[in-house]
């Protein structure tokens, strides 16, 4: 009997309101044993996949998707989905990314705190595990 897959959660660092030209990282979380995380934009037709997974906590794994320099066209709704063999999960709730004109430049601390959507709260990082800073812009052929 196949297990019921929990819905993933999605959050954004440093927040969901990002000054033009600043960076944002979407963090998708799911259970242990996820093979692929997918970040979807607005609809299923625009997405980015990664198989580079972190052990986020004893019961969770995660993946990170980073936009290095946010443009107005990046504003919109994002959600996560994952593949844990042999099936895909349901989608997370949508997270809305807002892009605003920046008066203080890319390092201006005027973003909202990290926001998450989904059924689970993000637990603290487990000290055993590697959590490297992310730096990838989302794939042009998919999410721009």
């Amino acid at each position: 009997q196949e297990e019921d897959l929990p819905r993933p959660s999605i959050s954004a660092e440093p927040g969901t309101v990002i000054p033009l030209g600043s960076h944002v990282t979407f963090v998708c979380r799911g259970p242990v044993g996820v093979q692929t995380f997918r970040l979807e934009r607005d609809s299923r037709s625009t997405y980015n996949d990664t198989e580079d997974v972190s052990q986020a906590s004893p019961s969770e794994s995660e993946a990170r998707f980073r936009i290095d320099s946010v443009r107005e066209g990046n504003a919109g709704l994002y959600r996560c989905i994952y593949y844990k063999p042999p099936k895909w999960s349901e989608q997370s709730d949508y997270l809305e990314l807002l892009v605003k004109e920046s008066s203080g430049g890319p390092d201006s601390p005027d973003t909202e705190p990290g926001s998450s959507a989904g059924p689970t709260q993000r637990p603290s990082d487990n000290s055993h595990n590697e959590h490297a800073p992310a730096s990838q812009g989302l794939k042009a052929e998919h999410l721009y």
Epitope: Q35, E51, D52, Q55, E130, A132
Partner: antibody, heavy 120, light 107 residues
Framework: EVQLVESGGGLVQPKGSLKLSCAAS????????MHWVRQAPGKGLEWVAR??????????YYADSVKDRFTISRDDSQSMLYLQMNNLTTEDTAMYYC???????????WGQGTSVTVSS | DIQMAQSSSSFSVSLGDRVTITCKAS??????LAWYQQKPGNAPRLLIS???SLETGVPSRFSGSGSGKDYTLSITSLQTEDVATYYC?????????FGGGTRLEIK
């Protein structure tokens, strides 16, 4: 079918250097973390190094036995993985495998390996 | 570093036997445990990940179980092609570590 083909092994003197290469094909290389794992003759498996993807800043991790001597790197545009090995000792004699990461640390596809012998 | 101890370095077995190989971690690895099969002259092959999940193409006579520090690989009815060395590996934390291996030999 996923393919990982290692090259660059050979005979090298102690304190010498060698650079191993791994050509990856038939999968989206830039979305996977990658590893090097080695196996000394007649011995078990030893994890050597791991490199993550650009989305995780190409973060690298090493076994204590190779830290500060070996460097793992990648070229996503060419789907290539590398291992630069410096200050080699006889303890580094082994078959070196290029391996694809799965599930955040498990290893699902392995190359056939390239042999490194360190001897004077 | 997390140490991985396998039950025995070698087993003498008969075809058709049920075989159980155990692996014990020095601390809880939260089911981040993989099993590999290696035949002489070949690269290892991933059999099981996340302690219990059988990889595609692996025969159903193989199964994995366990949690916490203690894990088991079982082969229900040993076939000729199963004669190999089996390794466990933890991927809860770096440095990733393998067990010493368990070699199956035919009696």
């Amino acid at each position: 079918e996923v393919q990982l083909v290692e090259s660059g092994g050979g005979l090298v003197q102690p304190k010498g250097s060698l650079k191993l290469s791994c050509a990856a094909s038939d999968f989206t290389f830039n979305t996977y973390a990658m590893h090097w794992v080695r196996q000394a003759p007649g011995k078990g498996l030893e994890w050597v190094a791991r490199i993550r993807t650009k989305s995780n800043n190409y973060a690298t991790y090493y076994a204590d036995s190779v830290k500060d001597r070996f460097t793992i790197s990648r070229d996503d545009s060419q789907s290539m993985l590398y291992l630069q090995m410096n200050n080699l000792t006889t303890e580094d004699t082994a078959m070196y495998y290029c391996v694809r990461d799965r599930y955040g640390g498990a290893m699902d596809y392995w190359g056939q390996g390239t042999s490194v012998t360190v001897s004077s | 570093d997390i140490q991985m101890a396998q039950s025995s370095s070698s087993f003498s077995v008969s075809l058709g036997d049920r075989v159980t190989i155990t692996c014990k971690a020095s601390e809880d690895i939260y089911i981040r445990l993989a099993w590999y099969q290696q035949k002489p002259g070949n690269a290892p092959r991933l059999l099981i990940s996340t302690a219990t999940s059988l990889e595609t193409g692996v025969p159903s006579r193989f199964s994995g179980s366990g949690s916490g520090k203690d894990y088991t690989l079982s082969i229900t009815s040993l076939q000729t092609e199963d004669v190999a060395t089996y390794y466990c590996q933890q991927y809860w934390s770096t440095p990733y570590t393998f067990g010493g291996g368990t070699r199956l030999e035919i009696k």
